[in-house]
Interface confidence: low
């Protein structure tokens, strides 16, 4: 008799794939305009990514450190108007892409949270939080809590006010803090409170320091859901060395967790995002006319035109990993194990009960590497096989789909390997 | 705000080199897209090279292609132009220009937000 099926865990829409962030409305189009009727335009490009939400703005009215200027429930007219956002939330809803609506405060000044009258400005959060899902958001971001006094409270609040409306409704909250010991005080009190930081970029990025700060995390969140990103806000390009930007692109997506995506990190796009220095945002490179004053032809190897007709480009291969990481039941979902590696890569396999697993081999390092897998600390549920396929690389010239010795597994420098393997009784 | 400032210029005889230097202040510099431009005598500031963010992308006007190298040392907040094979044509002001929007860098002046004081560069035949 077949072994019984393990039963499938709740998956809420924010477990099914990537979240993309756009902050900033003029940097992501790019023409000058800037403004929700011409974001709708883009919502194809962002079907094409395969992302689940788009974590928006924030596009509400904030003058400059000036909380009564300061109103969440109405939009800055240079974005648009309310129905201007409601035929957003409409066509988005057509292409199953969830609007997520940033509410940080004072996001034009100096302190996020303006620096007194904390009561005022949560209850005007509040206010907006109900505002906001009456008009069918499907969740909010608040980024840089660090600023904010009493931030567990004020998210546990917050949290209620979005789960009593729908289990369906997500808030995610986001710091620059770095630090696990405060990272797990804001998620112990919040229970379903998606959390982005910078807990990743405090890395010396290696093999093994990934791997211990990844193991860490998941060790300390038990089996709470998580998200996986760099920073809070900024793009990938700003926290990695470039020839690790495919290899992170490849963890991200097959971590246990939600991906989430600052615009332009599909193509590396480049930009400042040092912490504490305000920075205004990259402009998107769709083709080689996102280059105002460029004269002759860039490098058409950098936009999003140029990177979709490449099939070994950063685009594709985000296309591709997105694609696999909303379809297949072992990355949906799927228990963790780390392998034991040597301090040049890190590797880790995805499984799921009788469902296809995966093998995920990081070669942090300068040189290439020969690794031998062996699944010495492995439970017996998650063995490995001599041999797996080779489902993508981050390099090109791999014979993809050929199946490849696991003991005798050689890496190029900065590579990253996505193998899979059947289950076997 | 970036504070720019140029060095390394002087005179050269045509088919030397120089190397300029344009040390940047004031903000995060590996944010910034880097130019430099010239300015002869009675002209018109023209383009002359573009460097990216990472240094990863670099861009040149057809006239000193091949003989001038744009590069970037973030660590020192330094972008340099290496000149060779000068010819008298080379002679102007050379500016540094730093663009803070995005990290491409342009070729048209408009494209850069902060400039330095400029350094001149003379070739002698």
């Known amino acids: 008799r077949a072994p019984r099926c393990r039963d499938l865990p709740v998956q809420k829409w924010w477990h099914t794939g990537a979240l993309y962030r756009i902050g900033d409305l003029q940097g992501f189009q790019g023409n000058g305009a800037g403004n929700l009727a011409g974001l709708k335009g883009h919502l194809d490009y962002l079907s094409s990514l395969k992302v689940k939400g788009l974590v928006l703005g924030p596009i509400h009215k904030n003058q400059k450190d000036d909380v009564a200027g300061t109103d969440l429930l109405q939009i800055d007219p240079n974005f648009g108007s309310k129905e201007d956002f409601a035929s957003l939330l409409q066509s988005a809803k057509k292409k199953s892409i969830r609007i997520i609506l940033d509410l940080t405060p004072n996001y034009q000044g100096e302190n996020s949270w303006f620096s007194t009258q904390v009561d005022t400005v949560a209850t005007k959060v509040k206010d907006a939080l109900e505002f906001w899902l009456q008009a069918g958001v499907d969740g909010f971001q608040v980024r840089d809590i660090e600023n904010l006094k009493d931030a567990s409270s004020f998210l546990a609040e917050w949290q209620n006010i979005t789960k009593g409306f729908s289990e369906d409704r997500l808030l995610i909250a986001g710091t620059n803090s770095s630090d696990l010991q405060q990272i797990l005080s804001l998620l112990e009190s919040n229970k379903d409170l998606l959390l982005t930081s910078s807990y990743l970029s405090n890395s010396s990025f290696t093999g093994e320091h990934t791997k211990s700060l990844v193991t860490q995390y998941l060790n300390a969140t038990g089996n709470r859901w998580c998200s996986w990103s760099l920073s809070q806000a900024g793009l990938l390009t700003s926290f990695l060395p470039a020839q690790l930007l495919r290899l992170y692109q490849l963890m991200l997506f097959t971590l246990p967790g939600t991906p989430v995506f600052s615009y332009g990190d599909e193509i590396g796009l480049e930009a400042a995002a040092v912490p504490g220095q305000p920075v205004e945002a990259p402009v998107m490179l769709w083709d080689e006319s996102s280059f105002p004053f460029i004269s002759a032809a860039g490098s058409a190897n950098m936009t999003v035109k140029g990177q979709s007709e490449d099939p070994g480009s950063l685009l594709s291969l985000f296309r591709r990993l997105s694609d696999q990481r909303s379809k297949e039941r072992s990355l949906l979902h799927g228990d963790f194990h780390a392998l034991s590696s040597g301090p040049g890569f890190f590797s880790y396999i995805r499984h799921w009960d009788q469902n296809e697993r995966f093998l995920v081999v990081l070669n942090f390092g300068d040189v290439g590497l020969s690794a031998g897998l062996q699944a010495s600390d492995l439970p017996a549920s998650a063995s490995l096989p001599a041999k797996a396929d080779l489902l993508l690389s981050t390099q090109p010239g791999r014979d993809e789909g050929s199946p490849l010795e696991l003991e005798r597994l050689k890496l190029e420098p900065h590579e990253g390997l996505l193998l899979r393997f059947p289950y076997v009784a | 705000q970036v504070q720019l400032v140029e060095s390394g210029g002087g005179l050269v005889q045509a088919g030397g080199s120089l190397r300029l230097s344009c040390a940047a202040s004031?903000?995060?510099?590996?944010?910034?897209?880097m130019g430099w431009f010239r300015q002869a005598p009675g002209k018109e500031r023209e383009f002359v090279a573009t460097?990216?963010?990472?240094?990863?992308?670099?861009y040149y006007a057809d006239s000193v292609k091949g003989r001038f190298t744009i590069s970037r040392d973030n660590a020192k907040n330094t972008v340099y132009l290496q000149m060779n094979s000068l010819k008298p044509e080379d002679t102007a002001v050379y500016f540094c220009?730093?663009?803070?929007?995005?990290?491409?860098?342009?070729?048209?002046?408009?494209?850069?937000?902060?400039w330095g004081q400029g350094t001149q560069v003379t070739v002698s035949s």
């Open positions: 004031g903000r995060a510099f590996s944010s910034n897209g």
């Open positions: 220009a730093a663009d803070t929007r995005h990290c491409m860098g342009y070729t048209k002046d408009e494209g850069y937000a902060y």
């Open positions: 460097i990216s963010c990472s240094g990863t992308s670099t």
